[in-house]
């Protein structure tokens, strides 16, 4: 019964936020580079 409970943990949330922040930075950098190259 206890398997799989408490999966929406703060540690998981922080990791997800860090990944989102990283991806936003990478994509933002690529976008700026494309604009610059135009």
């Amino acid at each position: 019964h206890s398997d799989g409970i408490f999966t929406d943990s703060y540690s998981r949330y922080r990791k997800q936020m860090a990944v989102k922040k990283y991806l936003a930075a990478v994509l933002g950098k690529r976008y700026k580079q494309r604009v610059k190259n135009k």
């Epitope: 206890s2 999966t7 929406d8 943990s9 703060y10 949330y13």
Partner: antibody
Framework: QSVEASGGHLVTPGTPLTLTCTVS????????MNWVRQAPGKGLEWIGS??????KYYASWAKGRFTISRTSSTTVNLKMTSPTTEDTATYFC?????????WGQGTLVTVSS | AQVLTQTPSSVSAAVGGTVTINCQSS????????LSWYQQKPGQPPNLLIY???SLASGVPSRFSGSGSGTQFTLTISDLECDDAATYYC??????????FGGGTEVVVK
């Protein structure tokens, strides 16, 4: 990302009342939501929760008195089936499984005749 | 039912001092570490300080620290500041999917 509880007001004892928790910035399909209450001048009391898979858990004292339901990808309800004066409190909803990391401001429920 | 006993119920300390709050659970929390600590100020919702017994939540000063495992846990606030005046709660998660809160500790800063 935020959560907000609403629907609290003055009710007479025995009159059912439904509170709503509305979330923004995330989906309830990947989040566990909890209801916690606080009587005036008292401590925090966990009522129950609904997890990502819609499993529901209740404090032993809350079984039969409260019903939690996920009504959409952004809303969770707490139904007070037959409130008594002892249920007068601020009701908070909070996200988290294992700990509560996003809290709403809370909604005040007053049960009085 | 799970019972979390928090002591003391109130504590007073001077600015720059240290406060220790204890939380004892009637049974082991989930994974022996699913114990969290919250700060609450009047008219506000609680705010997560410590999760998984000893991990500091984002944006929380390192003056706050948590320790413990199983059934015994401690929150320590060092270099006390006026802004630390609040009520502090522990909360435990248990392997039946339920939670419990401690009764709270009021911290008064002199």
């Amino acid at each position: 990302q935020s959560v907000e509880a609403s629907g609290g007001h003055l009710v007479t004892p025995g009159t059912p009342l439904t509170l709503t928790c509305t979330v923004s910035g995330f989906s309830l399909s990947s989040a566990a939501m909890n209801w916690v209450r606080q009587a005036p001048g008292k401590g925090l009391e966990w009522i129950g929760s609904v997890d990502e898979r819609q499993n529901k858990y209740y404090a032993s004292w809350a079984k039969g008195r409260f019903t939690i339901s996920r009504t959409s990808s952004t809303t969770v309800n707490l139904k007070m089936t037959s409130p008594t004066t002892e249920d007068t409190a601020t009701y908070f909803c909070a996200r988290g499984g294992g700990e509560f990391f996003i809290w709403g401001q809370g909604t005040l429920v007053t049960v009085s005749s | 039912a799970q019972v979390l006993t928090q002591t003391p119920s109130s504590v007073s300390a001077a600015v720059g001092g240290t406060v220790t709050i204890n939380c004892q659970s009637s049974q082991s929390v989930y994974s022996n570490n699913r114990l969290s600590w919250y700060q609450q100020k009047p008219g506000q919702p609680p705010n997560l300080l410590i999760y998984e017994a000893s991990s500091l939540a984002s944006g929380v000063p390192s003056r706050f620290s948590g320790s413990g495992s199983g059934t015994q846990f401690t929150l320590t606030i060092s270099d006390l500041e006026c802004d630390d005046a609040a009520t502090y709660y522990c909360a435990g998660a248990y392997n039946t999917g339920i939670y419990g809160f401690g009764g709270g500790t009021e911290v008064v800063v002199k």
